[in-house]
């Protein structure tokens, strides 16, 4: 796979980590989350041109078949390779509790 | 998440496993793979409407933010949740070897 910053479509256009600010209302969490009021959501956004950050053999196959049959096989997609944990302080039936979510914030990205 | 077949866009339109027949030439493998001559590539294809087969909390967030900011945040993407191994008989410098690849064929799919 090419270096993560070596995007053939131009700087910042390929699959990489972005941060999107979102309120509890944006996320539909206002009725069950007390804190934080706002989340800096890290997510994977960007194009996956040929072999860019290819996650595995399957991603390489997908690239080849997309080139051959673009109407049938989609290009690889930019998704999280790993996550950073995050805590939410949330309302429950029994009161308030602090819960750790391991799959909420993307840590790094790849194409698959 | 909704049941995998309960696609709001119509039967078979949402994220699911598809099989695509590909020759070694299609895959660019003709010069290093001896067998099989043709691969039934299982891959994940289809739309990811709201909460359909959402892989995790991150996918749910992505759905919410895509609804709010469709130009900034892409919809979740249909990708493999797990893989089936596959054996390739391949050419090596010293002859032929049998190699197992764990990340070649999608086994099931989810949206992320």
């Amino acid at each position: 796979a090419r270096n993560g910053d070596d995007c053939p479509l131009g700087p910042g256009r390929c699959c990489r980590l972005h941060t999107v600010r979102a309120s509890l209302e944006d996320l539909g969490w206002a009725d069950w989350v007390l804190s934080p009021r706002e989340v800096q959501v890290t997510m994977c956004i960007g194009a996956c041109p040929s072999q860019f950050r290819a996650a595995n053999m399957h991603a390489q196959i997908k690239t080849s078949l997309h080139r051959l049959k673009p109407d049938t096989v989609p290009a690889p997609c930019c998704v999280p390779a790993s996550y950073n944990p995050m805590v939410l302080i949330q309302k429950t039936d029994t009161g308030v509790s602090l819960q750790t979510y391991d799959d909420l914030l993307a840590k790094d990205c790849h194409c698959i | 998440a909704r049941n995998g077949d309960d696609c709001p866009l119509g039967p078979g339109r949402c994220c699911r496993l598809h099989t695509v027949r590909a020759s070694l030439e299609d895959l660019g493998w003709a010069d290093w793979v001896l067998s099989p001559r043709e691969v039934q590539v299982t891959m994940c294809i289809g739309a990811c409407p709201s909460q359909f087969r959402a892989a995790n909390m991150h996918a749910q967030i992505k759905t919410s933010l895509h609804r709010l900011k469709p130009d900034t945040v892409p919809a979740p993407c249909c990708v493999p949740a797990s893989y089936n191994p596959m054996v390739l008989i391949q050419k090596t410098d010293t002859g032929v070897s049998l190699q197992t690849y764990d990340d070649l064929l999608a086994k099931d799919c989810h949206c992320i």
Partner: antibody
Framework: QVTLKESGPGILQSSQTLSLTCSFS??????????VSWIRQPSGKGLEWLAH???????RYNPSLKSRLTISKDTSRNQVFLKITSVDTADTATYYC???????????WGQGTTLTVSS | DVVMTQTPLSLPVSLGDQASISCRSS???????????LEWYLQKPGQSPKLLIY???NRLSGVPDRFSGSGSGTDFTLKISRVEAEDLGVYYC????????FGGGTKLEIK
């Protein structure tokens, strides 16, 4: 299971530097939203918040003690440290570390370590 | 700095009675994000403090419903509807909206 444990010298002379360690388990300071505070309590008196360190290494200090305090962390070893320079008898207290979430929420506390400063 | 003033300093009660503790801040503790980060802690003799109430009125999971918090702006109250022996100790209010500060404490004791 979340636990925190403070350790320190026990006794110091006036003008020396106090070094405290908070060793914790059951959570990690790579987790967005979590932090650790140091809080002290002179015998028979109330609680005084000293300093806080967030997961992203942002730090906050009690303004009245800021010039004497340094908080730091070793994420890989699950430890948070506090240094207080130029201690005097007014610093004699039980020192607690506590896990915090966002702007408070101290849901787990250590059992405290006692410091006596002699003149 | 925000000063948190608790009253009374000492609160003698009979078991089964209601107890009410007041906490007043020297300025509004409504954070710029809209949160009012006011908490209540109980410290029993020889123990570390324990969090009871989060953000004015939200009881921590496992805290009995005889504990309730209320208030806004600068005036806050913790009520215990029927005091039990295990409730005795020192109660502290705490604000985390500005530079973090504890109140001076209120000792709940048997009359």
């Amino acid at each position: 299971q979340v636990t925190l444990k403070e350790s320190g010298p026990g006794i110091l002379q006036s003008s020396q530097t106090l070094s405290l360690t908070c060793s914790f388990s059951g959570f990690s300071l790579i987790t967005s939203g979590l932090g650790v505070s140091w809080i002290r309590q002179p015998s028979g008196k109330g609680l005084e918040w000293l300093a806080h360190i967030y997961w992203d290494d942002d730090k906050r200090y009690n303004p009245s003690l800021k010039s004497r305090l340094t908080i730091s962390k070793d994420t890989s070893r699950n430890q948070v440290f506090l240094k207080i320079t130029s201690v005097d008898t007014a610093d004699t207290a039980t020192y607690y570390c506590a896990r915090g979430g966002y702007d408070g929420y101290y849901d787990y506390w250590g059992q405290g370590t006692t410091l006596t400063v002699s003149s | 700095d925000v000063v948190m003033t608790q009253t009374p300093l000492s609160l003698p009660v009979s078991l089964g009675d209601q107890a009410s503790i007041s906490c007043r801040s020297s300025q509004s503790i409504v954070h710029s994000n809209g949160n009012t980060n006011l908490e209540w802690y109980l410290q029993k003799p020889g123990q570390s403090p324990k969090l009871l109430i989060y953000k004015v009125s939200n009881r921590l999971s496992g805290v009995p419903d005889r504990f309730s918090g209320s208030g806004s702006g600068t005036d806050f109250t913790l009520k215990i509807s029927r005091v039990e022996a295990e409730d005795l100790g020192v109660y502290y209010c705490f604000q985390g909206s500005h530079v973090r500060t504890f109140g001076g404490g209120t000792k709940l004791e048997i009359k």
